[in-house]
């Protein structure tokens, strides 16, 4: 049978050939009659057999990491007969490991983020090195990790490569650290190979800093004429944190008058002091307010770092402006009865200079020539007023400072003209009245109504009467309907166009004013040949129209 021991060949041998062992048949008595042969992958190129002795040699440098074993076949032949002495047999040559590979960090680059101020022992990252050597061959691939750079802030677990924090770090002092980790094989024994890797450890921000005002005192000025919403000035607080942890909000602590407010400029994180109410130099020339700043987002566990919020004092100086005059009232409503003589005082308006110098005023009036104003602000009539012409006057009074005529203010003055009963009622229209020749007694000839140009506090009430003076006109009669209308009735049967073509009826209309006014009105009644229809609608076309005027007494 075959005789051999396990074959091993060390990798990376530099010799031209290396004796591995001997293959032989136990039938080989050394009579020089056997020939040994090697077959299979690597035979003749990597491995050579001395065909006389069965000695096997490696003639190439081998790399276990490339190939760790070779399976070959052995033959032994009797030279004399050419026949196999033993059955062909498979055998294995194992390439034994030497420590020829250094540990390598395959997952580079390493980068980790850990919150600042993390406590000792906090896990940062695990780095892992790989060693291509045989893990089952001694300590060739057994690794130990150590820290070459990064003390005293970091430590590494020797067997796991876990990096932990060993000292608290403040991002505001240094925000990133380069840690160098070394991995050594042979568990660090002499002859060990090593590899290193760099780990970039970035500290993420925690809100461990409160915002602090850059200045403890700010001085701003604002014109008293500044409108609401005006930016008065900017205040600035600094927070060493970043991002959301540096977001801040400003507030005003001492401002009982609620005149100021602070809004934030999100781009610059500045506080903008704005005007919430108008200021008046003459009322208050400066304001002292205190502003406070705090972070928008504070975790409970970091609250102790945020007690005693930073404050700053802001002095706002109000600048005096030459202000225009100010009327006592925003507008005026004055009343005057109609019919008063010119020069009658309607009322008085008053404007004053809000500034300390108290300039005298000069007044101007526009909107109607019926009024004038003097330097005291007294408005008088320049004409007699007739309510029936205009019941209201819309005037504009302009006040100007005599010291500075550019400073002008205006106020509206509304003058209401009161009614007095100075107008008698009269026919509401011109009546074209016709009566048919064949009219019967009691037949309605005309319904009349009146108007009164006066204003009535209550409703107007008109009284209609046939004038007693109109004695020659008994052909018609008047009936007051008590509803501000009256009806004219035929008082006879039949009229003669040729003999009496026209009748003039004098009608008195009185109002209910105090005192009452009465007007005399003449109603012209024309006789018309209506035919059988007794319809006066065609009468106007017959050229019988007599245009008569009104007469009012």
């Amino acid at each position: 049978g075959w005789v051999w021991n396990q074959f091993f060949v060390p990798e990376e041998m530099n010799t031209t050939s290396h004796h591995i062992g001997q293959l032989r048949s136990d039938l080989d008595n050394g009579n020089n009659s056997f020939q040994y042969k090697l077959l299979g992958a690597g035979a003749g190129s990597t491995f050579i057999i001395d065909e006389r002795t069965g000695d096997i040699y490696a003639i190439q440098k081998l790399d276990r990491e490339e190939r760790s074993l070779y399976i070959l076949r052995a033959q032994v032949i009797d030279i004399a007969t050419g026949r196999a002495v033993e059955p062909e047999s498979e055998f294995v040559i194992k390439v034994s490991d030497i420590n020829d590979n250094e540990p390598k960090f395959l997952d580079e680059p390493y980068e980790a983020i850990v919150p600042e101020m993390s406590p000792e022992g906090t896990l940062v990252i695990q780095v892992t090195a790989s060693d291509a050597d045989d893990p089952s061959s001694g300590n060739n691939a057994r690794l130990l990790y150590s820290l070459l750079q990064g003390q005293p802030y970091f430590s590494v677990e020797p067997t796991t490569g876990v990096i932990r924090i060993s000292s608290k770090m403040d991002r505001e002092l240094q925000d990133e650290y380069w840690v160098i980790i070394q991995a050594k094989d042979m568990i660090g024994q002499p002859g060990a190979l090593s590899g290193t890797t760099s780990v970039l450890i970035k500290l993420s921000d925690v809100n461990d800093n409160k915002p602090i005002f850059k200045e403890s005192f700010y001085r701003f000025t604002i014109s008293e004429s500044a409108p609401i919403g005006t930016s008065i000035g900017k205040i600035m607080a600094y927070d060493d944190d970043i991002g959301e942890n540096a977001e801040m909000e400003y507030s005003i602590e001492d401002d009982d008058s609620k005149i100021f407010d602070i809004i934030i400029d999100n781009d610059t994180q500045e506080g903008i002091v704005i005007l919430k109410k108008k200021v008046d130099f003459e009322q208050q020339s400066y304001y002292g307010i205190r502003a406070k700043v705090k972070n928008c987002h504070v975790d409970e566990e970091l609250a102790p770092a945020h007690v005693n919020a930073s404050t700053t004092y802001i002095k706002v100086q109000v600048e005096d402006e030459d202000e225009p005059p100010v009327f006592l009232l925003p507008y005026y409503i004055l009343e005057i009865p109609e019919g008063k003589p010119y020069g009658t005082i309607v009322g008085t308006v008053s404007a004053t200079d809000p500034d300390r110098r108290q300039s005298p005023m000069r007044y101007y009036l526009t909107g109607s020539k019926m009024f004038d104003i003097n330097d005291n602000g007294t408005i008088i009539t320049t004409n007699m007023l007739d309510r029936e012409v205009s019941a209201w006057y819309n005037l504009t009074v302009t006040a100007t400072e005599t010291y500075n005529v550019q400073q002008i203010s205006s106020a509206h003055v509304y003058v209401q003209v009161f009614n007095i009963n100075d107008n008698a009622p009269e026919f509401s229209q011109f009546y074209e009245t016709y009566v048919c020749e064949n009219a019967e007694s009691g037949e309605i000839v005309q319904i009349i109504s009146a108007i009164d140009r006066d204003e009535s506090i209550e409703d107007h009430h008109f009284y209609f009467n046939h004038s007693l003076e109109d004695t020659n006109n008994s052909s018609f009669m008047l009936t007051d309907n008590q509803d501000n209308t009256a009806v004219i009735l035929s008082n006879r049967t039949g009229f003669n166009l040729k003999e009496e073509p026209v009748f003039y009826m004098i009608i008195l209309i009185a109002d209910n004013g105090i005192p009452s006014l009465t007007s005399t009105n003449t109603l012209t009644i024309q006789v018309c040949d209506c035919g059988d229809s007794r319809n006066t609608e065609t009468c106007a076309n017959k050229g019988l129209l007599f245009i008569m005027g009104f007469r009012t007494e």
Epitope: S17, H19, N31, N32, S33, I48, D50, I59, I79, A80
Partner: antibody, heavy 122, light 108 residues
Amino acid sequence: QVQLQESGPGLVKPSETLSLTCTVSGGSINSYYWSWIRQPPGKGLEWIGYIYYIGSTNYNPSLKSRVTISVDTSKNQFSLKLSSVTAADTALYYCARESRYRSGWYDAFDIWGQGTMVTVSS
Amino acid sequence: DIVLTQSPGTLSLSPGERATLSCRASQSVAGSYLAWYQQKPGQAPRLLIYGASSRATGIPDRFSGSGSGTDFTLTISRLEPEDFAVYYCQQYGKSPITFGQGTRLEMK
């Protein structure tokens, strides 16, 4: 064609080590067996031993304890070391190549060097 | 070890004659692995015959070998002047390789 050339000191003191080198030119040392043979003055030939190019050796039992044959394929050379020499080791030393007339076992020597004379004397 | 005995020790012949050299082994030579060499003064041996009967490259056909087992013969059919030299037989069928003591072929 392949030629062999022996080299080494011609005089060696008794008890010292005789060292010779055979340089192969005109061909490769690979795939052949290479022998050392000596011939004392006026006497016949004695085979000392061979080396296979991979380093496998076989020595004459009569000299085995004192002989070392080695090969350096990079230089195309093989060497002989004979330790503890005496006057009986004075001889003409030849290097020779076994032919490949047949596949397998030992073969005849088809190429010889011209020989180098080594005298052992104090 | 296999001991090879060559005879005669010296053989005196004239050119043109036939020479027969003998080599006897102390035990059978496996595979007829026997060779013949020619050595002239001041020269290295030269291979003539291998495998008992095969002529080496460039050897004239007047040289022939025969035999098996323990008895082997080298024959030179017609001696040429350059053939006068010392002839050695060698067995390489079993380690160690051994040579005969040699036969001197001299011109008569």
